[in-house]
């Protein structure tokens, strides 16, 4: 004969546990129904009556099957440096993430406490590691034979084009310039971007030629979008 199905509330067999989506109520000493996500326990069960559930009020939620007396409060509205990627509903908390071009510099238990704008790599340097939702951009000097002429949080160093006849040699922040005859092959048809979760846009510049092919920590600054390495006050 099949075992009889017990309806909540019921007293569990000694040594056994309550079934899925049930909990053991210590006061009633019975297995009782949990409330579904989006609800909470309005009235706890007794020996003769099951849990009475009610919907979460506005701006509150429960994400799991539960028997909490009150729903959890949704987090405060997203601050100006963040965007809401998940709305507050009866079944889930609001999730805020840093807006495009920013990353979470200081996190908290759930979400981000403070966002900061991503760093960019200056001409002569390319992105070694792109920014993510929780980490800043890492830059590296462009190796000999490669260049970056942008101030960007996505552009990597790319190879100089190879010329039949070189008019101006390339350096770390400028592509080689070929004579009017076309190059044997162009190794750098366009800026190369690293994929990354934060949407970014690079700015291209026309820097003046530099004397060296690889940057040092004191390389000449191109005109265009690169402020000086010094803390200039423009006096």
């Amino acid at each position: 004969l099949p075992a009889q199905v017990a309806f909540t509330p019921y007293a569990p067999e000694p040594g056994s546990t309550c079934r899925l989506r049930e909990y053991y109520d210590q006061t009633a000493q019975m297995c009782c129904s949990k409330c579904s996500p989006g609800q909470h326990a309005k009235v706890f069960c007794t020996k003769t009556s099951d849990t009475v559930c009610d919907s979460c009020e506005d701006s509150t939620y429960t994400q799991l099957w539960n028997w909490v007396p009150e729903c959890l409060s949704c987090g405060s509205r997203c601050s100006s440096d963040q965007v809401e990627t998940q709305a507050c509903t009866r079944e889930q908390n609001r999730i805020c993430t840093c807006r495009p071009g920013w990353y979470c510099a200081l996190s908290k238990q759930e979400g981000c406490r403070l966002c900061a704008p991503l760093r960019k790599c200056r001409p002569g340097f390319g992105v070694a590691r792109p920014g993510t939702e929780t980490s800043d951009v890492v830059c590296k000097p462009c190796a000999p034979g490669t260049f970056s002429n942008t101030t960007s949080s996505t552009d990597i160093c790319r190879p100089h084009q190879i010329c039949n006849v070189v008019a101006i040699p390339g350096n770390a922040s400028m592509d080689a310039v070929c004579t009017s005859t076309s190059p044997t092959r162009s190794m750098a048809p366009g800026a190369v971007h690293l994929p990354q979760p934060v949407s970014t846009r690079s700015q291209h510049t026309q820097p003046t030629p530099e004397p060296s092919t690889a940057p040092s920590t004191s390389f000449l600054l191109p005109m265009g979008p690169s402020p000086p390495a010094e803390g200039s006050t423009g006096d």
Epitope: R99, A105, R119, G224, P225, P227, E230
Partner: antibody, heavy 125, light 110 residues
Framework: EVQLVESGGGLVQPGGSLRLSCAAS????????ISWVRQAPGKGLEWVAY????????DYATWVNGRFTISLDNSKNTLYLQMNSLRAEDTAVYYC??????????????????WGQGTLVTVSS | DIQMTQSPSSLSASVGDRVTITCRAS??????LAWYQQKPGKAPKLLIY???DLASGVPSRFSGSGSGTDFTLTISSLQPEDFATYYC????????????FGGGTKVEIK
């Protein structure tokens, strides 16, 4: 030479308006986040507003309360601060300031490595 | 809103002295802190960023330390050109921010 030059300051009556300009040479504002920072006479530095042109985002100190607007004219490579409903307590030297370009190849918008010379705004009747 | 509190507000020192200025953040800001020097009638100048990194062209007698909420700017041997006002700044200027800068510390000649 890389520099920022502010202009547009002067004497204005309470409740009046003023538009400050910050012209850049040697850098392209469209690539950089840039702020306005002010300093009342004999007082400390106070951040006012920030614009990050790449992403079209602007931020203001909470006390601004919608009275000021930061904007950028890319064609002129000039930053503006439109100030309305001015009060006596807005009297200050206003600086534009851009991020820090380190010798290790970073441009970091979090810190102010490049400053203009400042322009004085006096709000008085 | 993160509050930045500097101390002392002013100090007197002599050339050659070791000078220490402190800055306290109202909440943990890890190492996102900068120090500036400002002389009368001039714009501020960045000295230290990321709490301890020396900005380009800044003399090595300036150093920064600390993380979390407590930070220090040290001038190992004060020079005549170092008499100025010094400010700390946290790196999070957004619409939640007011006191991005500390109140300043004026270093005067004793």
């Amino acid at each position: 030479e890389v520099q920022l030059v502010e202009s547009g300051g002067g004497l204005v009556q309470p409740g009046g308006s003023l538009r400050l300009s910050c012209a850049a040479s040697g850098i392209d504002f469209s690539s950089y986040g840039i702020s306005w920072v002010r300093q009342a006479p004999g007082k400390g530095l106070e951040w006012v507003a920030y614009i990050y042109p790449d992403y079209g985002s602007t931020d203001y100190a909470t006390w601004v309360n919608g009275r000021f607007t930061i904007s950028l004219d890319n064609s002129k490579n000039t930053l503006y601060l439109q100030m309305n409903s001015l009060r006596a307590e807005d009297t200050a030297v206003y600086y534009c300031a851009s991020g820090y370009a380190s010798s290790s190849g970073y441009y970091d918008p979090k810190y102010f490595g490049l400053w203009g010379q400042g322009t004085l705004v006096t709000v008085s009747s | 809103d993160i509050q930045m509190t500097q101390s002392p507000s002013s100090l007197s020192a002599s050339v050659g002295d070791r000078v220490t200025i402190t800055c306290r953040a109202s909440e943990d800001i890890e190492s996102y802190l900068a120090w500036y020097q400002q002389k009368p009638g001039k714009a501020p100048k960045l000295l230290i960023y990321d709490a301890s990194d020396l900005a380009s062209g800044v003399p090595s007698r300036f150093s920064g330390s600390g993380s979390g909420t407590d930070f220090t700017l040290t001038i190992s041997s004060l020079q005549p050109e170092d008499f100025a006002t010094y400010y700390c700044q946290h790196g999070f200027y957004t619409s939640r921010s007011d006191s991005v800068f500390g109140g300043g510390t004026k270093v005067e000649i004793k």
